[in-house]
Each structure stands twice: as structure tokens, then as C-alpha cells.
């Protein structure tokens, strides 16, 4: 149930060269430095476990400081194929090719990988985010234009001896960072090919990857301050639940969001917060250093365990789901945005969840591990937690089966 069983050599221990290789912040994403082409062109690349394309800015854009210049790379190969990726809001499109790619603060290897050279985009790049591309770490099934385009991590594992696993420690600052602070700050670690003991405390608990497309998991129970939301567990996973480092918030299906907000409101009713706060529109502020963390409840998500009828729970604090925001107009106060929001595409365990935990994406064994992060923000009274085992029956029933039709693969 935990990680105490022996592992093959090279899977565990110290990965000093990869520790602290991420920068950024939850609101704009965490990025790693990568090099592309020959001679190498250095770019900052968003680490995104919610998509599967390696895509980089390849043309001038007002929000990009630099971009991939294919014509300067002697190792670039054009695949003579376009790619178009629409989102609910925004899109990017580009041209497919391959080139040599490496991660300076990663494994000491170079791989030939598919690259989408982004030539046009809308609502994709973020002004001031300091990243110029995206590293989609999920599976080929959701790669664009189709699942024949091998994702970067698959290429890495196939072409090298790097074990088929990576782990992420995203470190929320607990206070707002200005642009220069972000550039100078440590954002966390992406350990490629292994697990670093120094990045977590306690035990790792694993949940099965339900299906290899997104990193899909199954939530079997939700509690607010220990009070069960008492919903049919299918609602928690309607239409899926995924772990996504490229999303800021904890996003919940409509019914679950409404029930959770109702419960959080009730637990924190000693203060009257505006409706706009729960919508993510209004900030709430307190005099510097006086944020009443204690009035806000902890949130526990119970995840399916590796053993039949066994689950474990991950618990986050308000320090994770209240996101610090700097606003010049209220700079004398500590201000926060509510970082739980409504979703029409299922539960998304974004940065606000991941910032509490060291998360192991054990692709080799089709499972995701959670342990308390050594860098999570907490106070002297409460800490994030990963605890188990708990007996939970009929967990398979909690998964939602998305209707498959012939047309479904055409949907975007």
C-alpha cells in the first residue's frame, strides 16, 4: 500500500542535479529550462501533466521574450504536418517537426523528440509568466493531432535508460511574488526517472492510474473539516478526475463545487465573505500577518488505494486553497483569491492540491503516489497530510464511464 517494498536500482535516492529545477508560481504555471536544437536554444517550458504535446513558441509574440528558431537548428526535421489545438477558450496551432532536446537540470541525456512549433496562438501564452512553451507529460491518447504523435516522455524512456517515472514537488510561496522574485525564487523540483527522499516526509501512498490518457484517478470520498460531503462518489469523478500541474485551481464538478462551497462557508461563518470571493472574482484581505487560517476548514480527498477496498486520504489546508495575490491598491494587507472553482469537465487536481504534496507519476506501475511535501505552506497548528489505510467498499463504482461514440474522437 505504501512505497516500502523494494524497488529496482536507480529508481530512488538522491537526484541532486534535478532538485530545485522548477521556477514559477501556481497562478502562472511552473516551468523547467530545456534546450532545443543544435546549437542548443534555451527555453523555459511549462510542466503540464494535463496534456501530451511538447509545443514551443516558434514565432514572435508580444508575450514571448524568446522563441524557437528552427532555421538556426542543424538537427531540425520537418514532419510536414500541421497541428491545431483548440481549447474551450483560446487555441494554439503550429507545425510538427523533430529535434534534439535536453533538460540541463535533468538526466544527462539528449533525445530526438516531436516538437510542435507554435506559429499562431490565442489566450495561450501568459504575459509575464516567463515560459515560452509547454511540456505535455500525459499519455499519447490525448496527443494532438492524434495518438500516433509520441509524447516527449515516451521518447525519453524509449531512447535512454531513464526509468519510466517522474515526480513533482511544486512549492507555493505562501505569499505573492513580484516578477523579479519569481525569477529569483525556487519553484520546486521535477525529478525525472526517480524519487528523491529529501522532497517529502512520511510515506508515499499510491492510487491507480485508471486509464492512461490524462493522469486519471478515482476519488471515493470528500470531507470538509472531517465532515463527509455525502454525495454519490460518481459525482466526484464526473466525468473524470485528473492530476494536472498545468491548472492553477482545484476544480470540481458543478454539484460537488456547490456542496463544497456550502460546507466551507458554514465552517468559516465567523466572517462574512462576499459572493464574489467564492466565484474567484473578489479578493479577501486581512491586515498583514493576521490571516485567520484557523477559521477555514481542511479539505480531504480520499483516493482509491492499490489494495481492494482500501483507500487513503490527502488533506490540504487553506494555505493551499487560498492563493496569495499582490494588489498595489491593497498592498498593506495580505490578500487572497479562493482557488477552488467550478468545472464542466470533471475534477482537476491542479497546483493548489499539488503544492501540498510530493507527487510521483509512476508510469511503469500505472500509479500515482502522494506524500506530504517538504516545502508545503502550513502553520503551527495544522499540516497537510497523507493518511491511510481506510476501508472503502465498491470503489470501482465511483469511476464514471464516459460514453464512447464513433464521433467522440472528433470532439475537442
Amino acid at each position: 500500500e505504501t512505497d516500502e517494498e523494494p524497488e529496482e536500482p536507480g529508481r530512488r535516492g538522491s537526484f541532486v542535479e534535478m532538485v530545485d529545477n522548477l521556477r514559477g508560481k501556481s497562478g502562472q504555471g511552473y516551468y523547467v529550462e530545456m534546450t532545443v536544437g543544435s546549437p542548443p536554444q534555451t527555453l523555459n517550458i511549462l510542466v503540464d501533466t494535463g496534456s501530451s504535446n511538447f509545443a514551443v513558441g516558434a514565432a514572435p509574440h508580444p508575450f514571448l521574450h524568446r522563441y524557437y528558431q528552427r532555421q538556426l537548428s542543424s538537427t531540425y526535421r520537418d514532419l510536414r504536418k500541421g497541428v491545431y489545438v483548440p481549447y474551450t477558450q483560446g487555441k494554439w496551432e503550429g507545425e510538427l517537426g523533430t529535434d534534439l532536446v535536453s533538460i540541463p537540470h535533468g538526466p544527462n541525456v539528449t533525445v530526438r523528440a516531436n516538437i510542435a512549433a507554435i506559429t499562431e496562438s490565442d489566450k495561450f501564452f501568459i504575459n509575464g509568466s516567463n515560459w515560452e512553451g509547454i511540456l505535455g507529460l500525459a499519455y499519447a491518447e490525448i496527443a494532438r493531432p492524434d495518438d500516433s504523435l509520441e509524447p516527449f516522455f515516451d521518447s525519453l524512456v524509449k531512447q535512454t535508460h531513464v526509468p519510466n517515472l517522474f515526480s513533482l514537488q511544486l512549492c507555493g510561496a505562501g505569499f505573492p511574488l513580484n516578477q523579479s522574485e519569481v525569477l529569483a525564487s525556487v519553484g520546486g523540483s521535477m525529478i525525472i526517472g526517480g524519487i528523491d527522499h529529501s522532497l517529502y516526509t512520511g510515506s508515499l501512498w499510491y492510487t491507480p492510474i485508471r486509464r492512461e490518457w490524462y493522469y486519471e484517478v478515482i476519488i471515493v470520498r470528500v470531507e470538509i473539516n472531517g465532515q463527509d460531503l455525502k454525495m454519490d462518489c460518481k459525482e466526484y469523478n464526473y466525468d473524470k478526475s485528473i492530476v494536472d500541474s498545468g491548472t492553477t485551481n482545484l476544480r470540481l464538478p458543478k454539484k460537488v463545487f456547490e456542496a463544497a462551497v456550502k460546507s466551507i462557508k458554514a465552517a468559516s461563518s465567523t466572517e462574512k465573505f462576499p459572493d464574489g470571493f467564492w466565484l474567484g472574482e473578489q479578493l479577501v484581505c486581512w491586515q498583514a500577518g493576521t490571516t485567520p487560517w484557523n477559521i477555514f476548514p481542511v479539505i480531504s480527498l480520499y483516493l482509491m488505494g492499490e489494495v481492494t477496498n482500501q483507500s487513503f486520504r490527502i488533506t490540504i489546508l487553506p494555505q493551499q486553497y487560498l492563493r496569495p495575490v499582490e494588489d498595489v491598491a491593497t498592498s498593506q494587507d495580505d490578500c487572497y483569491k479562493f482557488a477552488i472553482s467550478q468545472s464542466s469537465t470533471g475534477t482537476v487536481m491542479g497546483a493548489v492540491i499539488m503544492e501540498g504534496f510530493y507527487v510521483v507519476f509512476d508510469r511503469a506501475r500505472k500509479r500515482i503516489g502522494f506524500a506530504v511535501s517538504a516545502c508545503h505552506v502550513h502553520d503551527e497548528f495544522r499540516t497537510a497530510a497523507v493518511e491511510g489505510p481506510f476501508v472503502t467498499l465498491d470503489m470501482e463504482d465511483c469511476g464514471y464511464n464516459i460514453p464512447q461514440t464513433d464521433e467522440s474522437t472528433l470532439m475537442t
Epitope: 497562478g27 502562472q28 474551450t88 462576499p274 472574482e281 473578489q282 479578493l283 484581505c285
Partner: antibody
């Protein structure tokens, strides 16, 4: 420095429509909602609605839901308000404002005059 | 909708005086009230949020108080540049609503 730059005054005919703009600068555009407020002489301030630039989600005052349409263009950090089927009642000064706690920042005003 | 009532439409004060502008909400809005100053021909300027917190850069002669349904903006040591309309706003629930305004005239 946070700035909201609104488009210039408009003189329009009854029954037509107009599109006002509000260009934001000095902050991360997608991090804060933009509101629109109407002010008629002697009638105080009226909240029209708001838009979240990160996903174009909108919320309107019921009174204005058939009158105003809010849109956003993140590539230019600009929010738009389209006012339709204009009448003399729509003659007013319009403001955009940025959220935070209440409305800490306001645009400089756009005067709309509806006249035959 | 929540009504915000500023019963005094006009107030006339001399430089150096203290003035209190009041605002009443039709239902409990907690501390979710802001105050704005609007000078002739200009946009509103934000003064107070959360009923009693001054926005950055606002002189400390402006203070806000109240919670629930009754709110007050106090200007101590009134200056000639304080000649303006003052509006309260509730941002507790949608639709956001404003008071009708109080004009401060300087004698």
C-alpha cells in the same frame, strides 16, 4: 502602474449599437475580472456586469442582460462592451473597473450620446 | 437587490471641519462595503474597502466604519480638495449596488 484606457466618446443614432473598449495595462490581465458601470446625470452608479478575462465567463445585472454583451481579447488585454438597440435611456457615461477588493481601479470614462 | 441608501444628498462644511457621510444597506452585507470619491468630470476614486480599510495612498483623514447594515465615511480636517461626490457600494452579493451619492460642498 495599473491603467484602464477607455475608448473615446460616441455619438450614435437610436436603434443602432455601439462597442466600447477598455484596454488594461500594468498587471496580469487574466488575473482580475473587469466590470462595467453606467452613470447617468443625477442617477448615481449602476453595475452592468463583469467578465473574467481568463475564460470569458460573464455575469450580468438582470437589468442589462438584453442590453449589454461583454467580450474580451486577451492578446491585446482589452475588454469590450457592446450595447444594442440604443435609446435615449442609454445616453450616459460608462466606466470599466478592475476587480480586487471592490473596484480599486477605474477607467477614465466613455460618454455615449444617443441622438437622432 | 440590495438597496444602498445615502439619505443626505448634500453636505456643506468649512475647511478643517469633520464630516460624516452615512450609508444604509437594506440587508446585512457584513463588512463588504467600499467608498468612492468622484470629483466633477472625473472617474470615481477608490477610498475605502472592507468598510474600514484605506486603499493605498488614501490620506488618513478618510476613515470608514460600520458593519452589517450601517456604514459611515468620516473625513476629519476637511480640505478644499475634498469637494466631490461620495458613493458607497456593497460588493457582498450580485448585482453590486451603489448609494445615490452625497455631495460635499465647501463653504
Amino acid at each position: 502602474e495599473v491603467q484602464l484606457q477607455q475608448s473615446g466618446a460616441e455619438l450614435v443614432r437610436p436603434g443602432t449599437s455601439v462597442k466600447l473598449s477598455c484596454k488594461a495595462s500594468g498587471y496580469t490581465f487574466t488575473s482580475y475580472w473587469i466590470h462595467w458601470v453606467k452613470q447617468r446625470p443625477g442617477q448615481g452608479l449602476e453595475w452592468i456586469g463583469m467578465i473574467d478575462p481568463s475564460d470569458s465567463y460573464t455575469k450580468y445585472n438582470q437589468k442589462f442582460k438584453d442590453k449589454a454583451t461583454l467580450t474580451v481579447d486577451t492578446s491585446s488585454s482589452t475588454t469590450y462592451m457592446h450595447l444594442s438597440s440604443l435609446t435615449s435611456e442609454d445616453s450616459a457615461v460608462y466606466y470599466c473597473a478592475r476587480s480586487g477588493v471592490a473596484f480599486p481601479y477605474w477607467g477614465q470614462r466613455t460618454l455615449v450620446t444617443v441622438s437622432a | 437587490d440590495i438597496q444602498m441608501t445615502q439619505s443626505q444628498k448634500f453636505m456643506s462644511k468649512s475647511v478643517g471641519d469633520r464630516v460624516s457621510v452615512t450609508c444604509k444597506a437594506s440587508q446585512n452585507v457584513g463588512s463588504n462595503v467600499a467608498w468612492y470619491q468622484q470629483k466633477s468630470g472625473q472617474s470615481p476614486k477608490s477610498l475605502i474597502y472592507s468598510a474600514s480599510h484605506r486603499y493605498s495612498g488614501v490620506p488618513d483623514r478618510f476613515t470608514g466604519s460600520g458593519s452589517g447594515t450601517d456604514f459611515t465615511l468620516t473625513i476629519s480636517n476637511v480640505q478644499s480638495e475634498d469637494l466631490a461626490d461620495y458613493f458607497c457600494q456593497q460588493y457582498n452579493s450580485y448585482p453590486y449596488t451603489f448609494g445615490g451619492g452625497t455631495r460635499l460642498e465647501i463653504k
